[in-house]
């Protein structure tokens, strides 16, 4: 039975040209996290493996930085970065937990951070 929950930064917005931290946190389980994948739609952005550490996909390595923690920092944001991002926690014995973040990249300076919310 999967008892854990993933808390994410939720729906967030940021200014074009700026940077943003995508953060997920797995709680309410002592399952061993073997790997966390960060994906945008169907594209793999980065992997954080418990033994091997971070791997950033070559096509994103100029704009994506690992951390803080198991989070991911996106830099030099463009309007094309708007969309859904997923943190995928591979664990045992529980299995896979997925968190969703929606990022909106704005042209103006009215970007505000959304509230945190939980995904069961």
């Amino acid at each position: 039975m999967m008892t854990g929950t993933i808390e994410t930064t939720g729906n967030i917005s940021a200014e074009k040209g700026g940077s943003i931290i995508l953060q997920c946190h797995l709680s309410s389980t002592t399952a061993q996290v073997t790997q966390v994948n960060w994906e945008q739609q169907d594209q793999l952005l980065a992997i954080c493996n418990a033994d091997l550490g971070w791997h950033i996909s070559p096509s994103f390595k100029d704009r994506v930085a690992p951390g803080p923690g198991l989070g991911l920092t996106l830099q030099s944001l463009t309007v094309n970065d708007t969309g859904e991002y997923f943190c995928i926690y591979h664990t045992y014995p529980d299995g896979t937990y997925t968190g969703r973040i929606f990022l909106e990249v704005l042209e103006s300076s009215v970007a505000e951070h959304g509230a945190r919310f939980q995904i069961p």
């Epitope: 039975m1 399952a31 529980d94």
Partner: antibody, heavy 118, light 112 residues
Framework: EVQLVESGGGLVQPGGSLRLSCAAS????????MSWVRQAPGKGLELVAE????????YYPDTVKGRFTISRDNSKNTLYLQMNSLRAEDTAVYYC???????????WGQGTLVTVSS | DIVMTQSPLSLPVTPGEPASISCRSS???????????LEWYLQKPGQSPKLLIY???NRFSGVPDRFSGSGSGTDFTLKISRVEAEDVGVYYC?????????FGGGTKVEIK
């Protein structure tokens, strides 16, 4: 090489307290769930506590719930077990253990003996 | 709670001969993920336990191939194809498919 070294065991009176430590090296400590397993003299193995990699989640069986507290300091690569209200039946060798490769206790320390007696 | 029952309690063995230990769970230990998290440990006299087998049949690093694990659902077996003197000790099965995670009571293997 993965190394787990327990310390802090000793003789304590019933009702007393003790804090065990487990110093970890040879791996990224902050990436792993960690556990304490005990073995009473001449008896089998019993899981007594486990803690998630971040320290945010813990698990205890009913036999120790409310008396034992597992914690960790990822900056010091150290796992702890605070044992309060100790009873004679808590007398055991206490091992810390780490998962790996899809196994729950892939690596074990050498153990530290806790004796609860008046 | 899932009870893990091992048999026999004691197993006298002859070096070079095969040996088999049974572990039965009180209910299925197939996890929702489809994996069966059943492990075998050997604790030699005066030592810490050591992992032999994980996920029913996978040998851990450095474990000799004379050790093998099998089974499914509730019935599991550890086999030693040819017992060696260094294999003496207490063997434990363990499940962590379900909380609370539980050990079997142990099987003591000794040379005849």
């Amino acid at each position: 090489e993965v190394q787990l070294v327990e310390s802090g065991g000793g003789l304590v009176q019933p009702g007393g307290s003790l804090r065990l430590s487990c110093a970890a090296s040879g791996f990224t400590f902050s990436s792993y769930t960690m556990s304490w397993v005990r073995q009473a003299p001449g008896k089998g193995l019993e899981l007594v506590a486990e803690i998630s990699s971040s320290g945010g989640s813990t698990y205890y069986p009913d036999t120790v719930k409310g008396r034992f507290t597992i914690s960790r300091d990822n900056s010091k690569n150290t796992l702890y077990l605070q044992m309060n209200s100790l009873r004679a039946e808590d007398t055991a060798v206490y091992y810390c253990a780490r998962p790996g490769l899809g196994a729950w206790f892939a690596y074990w320390g050498q153990g530290t003996l806790v004796t609860v007696s008046s | 709670d899932i009870v893990m029952t091992q048999s026999p309690l004691s197993l006298p063995v002859t070096p070079g001969e095969p040996a088999s230990i049974s572990c039965r769970s009180s209910q299925s230990i197939v996890h929702n993920s489809g994996n069966t998290y059943l492990e075998w440990y050997l604790q030699k006299p005066g030592q810490s336990p050591k992992l032999l087998i994980y996920k029913v049949s996978n040998r851990f690093s450095g474990v000799p191939d004379r050790f093998s694990g099998s089974g499914s659902g509730t019935d599991f077996t550890l086999k030693i194809s040819r017992v060696e003197a260094e294999d003496v000790g207490v063997y434990y099965c363990f499940q962590f498919s379900h909380v609370p995670r539980t050990f079997g009571g142990g099987t003591k293997v000794e040379i005849k």
